[in-house]
């Protein structure tokens, strides 16, 4: 039975040109978290392998840091990162869990995070 | 220039064990996964598992795991798979490749090795 | 695990043709795919990683397309020097695993 939430930065704005840390974290289980996938819609921007380390997406090279710890920081943001980014969790036992990530990038300096919230 | 040098090929007696080495060269050997592919005659790729040398983090495929250990010389940047309670399935060609800078696919391959299981 | 099929085993073409050789994943495994040439008594080498980026120094008539399930490996005019096995890979997640393989021969 999965039984772990995902909390993640929930709802998140920043100002186009700066960067920006995506976050999530799984708990309420005691399952293995073997790989994080992080996703934009039908694209793959990087993997964090528990033992192999990060894969970074080519066409994201530049502009995705890893870390900090299985988050991801995306720099040099532009209009067109508005969207859904999803970090998907994959364990052992439990299976797949997901967390969901709506950035807004505005072209004003008024950037304000959004709350936390869960994703059971 | 990059250069993955293995160790010669092996006839080994079924139930023994046998330790492929991967000598490097070319670049800095801490900073790459090296991971192992096995290639039975005339057959596809299988990937046996993956170490990362600068913090001995290793991803085995679970068919292999319990039978094959992946270890690294750091002091010699070599890399080593030993596989052991050997049956004729076995036969077949071991490659070491490097994966690519943050990346998982393999941009360098050693040139193979060949291990024979025969009584 | 993830299972790739290259539907053909055998492609026969002549030099000069466009061929394209395809690579079906079991599931969504979004541009994680590699394409690596391997060459009679060789080994493998690496041609187009994440589905569409060329490896350097391989020729501009190799290219990869495809996201999700489907993924294409073509070769714009084929040249002689091109006859070998064809292997997909993804690396979406462990275990890696890799495509049956589709030699290239001549007609």
């Known amino acids: 039975m999965m039984t772990g939430t995902i909390e993640t930065t929930g709802n998140i704005s920043a100002e186009k040109g700066g960067s920006i840390i995506l976050q999530c974290h799984l708990s309420s289980t005691t399952a293995q978290v073997t790989q994080v996938n992080w996703e934009q819609q039908d694209q793959l921007l990087a993997i964090c392998n528990a033992d192999l380390g990060w894969h970074i997406s080519p066409s994201f090279k530049d502009r995705v840091a890893p870390g900090p710890g299985l988050g991801l920081t995306l720099q040099s943001l532009t209009v067109n990162d508005t969207g859904e980014y999803f970090c998907i969790y994959h364990t052992y036992p439990d299976g797949t869990y997901t967390g969901r990530i709506f950035l807004e990038v505005l072209e004003s300096s008024v950037a304000e995070h959004g709350a936390r919230f869960q994703i059971p | 220039e990059v250069q993955l040098q293995q160790s010669g090929p092996e006839l080994v007696k079924p139930g023994a064990s046998v330790k492929i080495s991967c000598k490097t060269s070319g670049y800095t050997f801490t900073e790459f996964t090296m991971h192992w592919v096995k290639q039975s005659h005339g057959k596809s790729l299988e990937w046996i598992g993956g170490l990362k040398p600068d913090n001995g983090g290793i991803s085995y495929n679970q068919k292999f795991k319990g039978r094959a250990t992946l270890a690294v010389d750091k002091s010699s940047n070599t890399a080593y798979m030993e596989l052991r309670s050997l049956t004729s399935e076995d036969s077949a060609v071991y490659y070491c490749a490097r994966g690519a800078y943050y990346r998982y696919d393999a941009d360098y391959w050693g040139q193979g090795t060949t291990l024979t299981v025969s009584s | 695990d993830i299972v790739l099929t290259q539907s053909h085993k055998f492609m026969s073409t002549s030099v000069g043709d466009r061929v394209s050789i395809t690579c079906k994943a079991s599931?969504?495994?979004?541009?994680?795919v590699a394409w690596y040439q391997q060459k009679s008594g060789q080994s493998p080498k690496l041609l187009i990683y994440?589905?569409?980026y060329r490896n350097t120094g391989v020729p501009d008539r190799f290219t990869g397309s495809g996201s999700g399930t489907d993924f294409t490996f073509t070769i714009d005019s084929v040249q002689a020097e091109d006859l070998a096995v064809y292997f997909c890979?993804?690396?979406?997640?462990?275990?890696?695993?890799f495509g049956t393989g589709t030699k290239l021969e001549l007609k």
């Open positions: 599931q969504d495994v979004k541009t994680a």
């Open positions: 890979q993804q690396h979406y997640s462990t275990p890696f695993t």
């Open positions: 994440s589905a569409s």
